[in-house]
């Protein structure tokens, strides 16, 4: 058990577009048809102006045309919800398909793509039906923009809400060596299929991706909870062949000086196909990127029953060391590790200022006043209203 | 244009020491596993060093001791440092680039022209 | 260390010809193994990283085999331009031997 772990089933509360939490300084776009279908016009259920967002410019062919939402932290956005054009019941405007894109830091956007690499993304069908997409996986954004789409010149327009949750665990991204296949009666890819970072030279850096998803693997590495993916896909795995130092080397980078009381790491131990637990973790830690790693690393060695071939949470406890930056080594006790999350524990620093504020001026981090301190990394604190009891696989995914 | 150009290959004497560069463009180096491989005439290739993205060196047993990889990010260029020389060490000299393929295995996907030392008096 | 040793060093053979390299590492590497072909004058080039995989751009008549100990590189139906030197490769992130190579030559 991921104890404290966020849970992805319940991070589905309205972020606030609907109940106007979301002021409409935080709603743009790349144009509008006129004022009356302006970008703050783009609340879901919403009649006001003309009854949606519509783009001055055409979606076909070139796509570039979006709205943007600013949730001004960082959040975990499981779903979000399309319509059309109200316009007093007459409108006939909506988008038949439309792409997301979104960013953590306003300077690096990514596409988002599902399980199978897909980035478009099914909408509406009228324009006053609500059709939810169910994020599989979900992305981890401060931005979220909406790219409608269209088959034919013809006339989109929007309405949307975002629903998930805060993104407690303040990590912006971790490093780690790119996952490799295992070579059983039949291929285990136990890559980081969702990593939304870079990739160079046998590296990912930059990103998040299947080990903060929220989805923990099952005992067996080769099934998975999800439907249609392929033999290891819930795992990140490495082998100890490839590896001459013995272990594998991770960095995490957090959005601000935090006080870390815990990592937990759900790992695989099928030990009759090679998987073992790590033998032990060792992790440094500094306060900014070019500062020297303080202190003795915390070293912690793992017993317990490693012949139970059970996946479990290994708890790594890290002593309420303050940092931004961590890197940490798994050893191994084994052919393979495989991991399927890695999740932290911790306290932001009380004054600590947030590692990206003022990468884009205008927008503040926090909301105004000041940051929320001592805060758990276990809180939800939802923005709007009850969790959306939608699941992926419903006929709206 | 991404590329490994190596210099700095020329006849030495024996017991000299040489220092080769490998400038690389269209890439930084300092995000990849980098690789020193040499090849003596009409013999097979054999590795002698490795640098990782984190500093780290890795080298063969026959070159720990004489041979020093390192590389200056500002410049992107890697070096091989070579001392006591022996005749021995007559080689063309490779660096070389690791990638992982789509299994997540790495390979040397990318190589430079190689440069020619010759040790002799 | 490990040791890479490969067999036969030397193989003549006609086009069309099905060609068999093998390697053998002093102990097991898994599948960390990567197969390099290289022509005289010119710097060596990928043919497969992790037993298995081929370059980009490299024919399908290539292939790799193996796990542990023992892998082979097969041409299923040797080419003009597949007379070469082939490599094999222990690459991990760290140590890196090669095996001693084997040379394919026109029969």
């Known amino acids: 058990d991921m104890k404290g772990h966020f849970d992805p089933a319940k991070c589905r509360y309205a972020l606030g577009m609907q109940d106007r939490t979301i002021p409409d300084s935080d709603i743009s776009a790349s144009s509008s048809w006129s004022d009356s279908t302006a970008a703050r016009h783009s609340r879901l259920e919403s009649s006001d102006g003309d009854g949606a967002w519509c783009p001055a410019g055409s979606v076909f062919p070139k796509e570039e045309e979006y709205l943007q939402v600013d949730l001004q932290r960082l959040h975990l956005v499981a779903l979000v919800g399309t319509q059309g054009r109200h316009a007093g019941g007459l409108g006939k405007e909506f988008s038949r398909s439309y792409r997301l894109r979104y960013s953590r830091d306003g300077r690096r956007w990514m596409d988002w793509k599902d399980r199978w690499g897909q980035e478009v993304i099914s909408g509406n069908e009228d324009p006053e039906g609500v059709v939810l997409k169910d994020l599989g996986p979900p992305m981890v954004a401060r931005l979220v923009r909406f790219y409608p789409r269209a088959d034919r010149v013809m006339s989109v327009c929007l309405r949307v809400e975002l629903y998930g949750c805060l993104w407690r665990d303040g990590l912006l991204s971790y490093t780690a060596p790119v996952g490799q296949t295992m070579y059983l009666s039949e291929a285990v890819y136990l890559n980081d299929s969702t990593y939304d970072g870079h990739t160079m030279g046998g590296l990912q850096y930059g990103g998040l991706g299947q080990l903060a998803d929220g989805v923990v693997g099952l005992d067996d590495f080769r099934k998975s909870q999800e439907l249609r993916v392929w033999p290891g896909y819930d795992y990140v795995g490495w082998s100890n062949h490839s590896f001459s130092s013995g272990y594998v080397e991770m960095e995490f980078e957090f959005d601000r000086l935090r006080a870390f009381q815990a990592m937990q790491v759900h790992c695989n131990n099928m030990h009759t196909l090679g998987a073992r637990l790590p033998g032990g973790v060792e992790c440094r830690f500094r306060r900014g990127p070019a500062m020297a790693w303080e202190g003795e690393p915390m070293r912690h060695n793992l017993g317990g029953n490693l012949g139970d071939p059970r996946a479990r949470a290994v708890s790594v406890p890290l002593g309420g060391r303050v940092a931004r930056f961590l890197q940490c080594r798994f050893l191994f006790a084994g052919p393979w590790l495989l991991f399927s999350e890695i999740s932290f524990i911790s306290d932001v620093v009380n004054n600590s200022s947030p590692a990206l504020g003022g990468t884009f001026p205008p927008a503040p981090w926090w909301p105004p006043g000041p940051p929320p301190t001592n805060f758990s990394s276990l809180e939800l604190e939802p923005r709007g209203q009850q969790p959306v009891a939608k699941a992926e696989g419903s006929p709206t995914a | 244009q991404v590329q490994l150009v190596e210099s700095g290959g020329r006849v030495v004497q024996p017991g000299r020491s040489l220092r080769l560069s490998c400038t690389a463009s269209g890439f930084s180096l300092n995000r990849y596993y980098m690789l020193w491989v040499r090849q003596a005439p009409g013999k097979g290739l054999e590795w002698i060093g490795t640098?990782?993205?984190?500093?780290?060196?890795y080298y063969a047993s026959w070159a720990k001791g004489r041979f020093t990889i390192s590389r200056d990010n500002s410049k992107n260029t890697l070096y091989l440092q070579m001392n006591s020389l022996r005749a021995e060490d007559t080689a063309v000299y490779y660096c070389?680039?690791?990638?992982?393929?789509?299994?997540?295995?790495?390979?040397?996907?990318?190589w430079g022209q190689g440069t020619l030392v010759t040790v002799s008096s | 260390d490990i040791q890479m040793t490969q067999s036969p060093s030397s193989v003549s053979a006609s086009v069309g010809d099905r060609v068999t390299i093998t390697c053998q590492a002093s102990q097991s590497i898994g599948s960390v193994l990567a197969w390099y072909q290289q022509k005289p004058g010119k710097a060596p080039k990928l043919l497969i990283s992790?037993?298995?995989d081929l370059a980009s751009g490299v024919p399908s008549r290539f292939s790799g085999s193996g796990s542990g100990t023992d892998f082979t590189l097969t041409i299923s139906s040797l080419q003009p331009e597949d007379f070469a030197t082939y490599y094999c490769q222990y690459i991990p992130y760290g140590s890196s031997p090669f095996g001693g190579g084997t040379k394919v030559e026109i029969k």
């Open positions: 640098i990782s993205y984190g500093d780290t060196t």
């Open positions: 070389a680039r690791a990638d992982t393929g789509d299994n997540g295995y790495l390979g040397l996907q990318l």
């Open positions: 992790g037993v298995f």
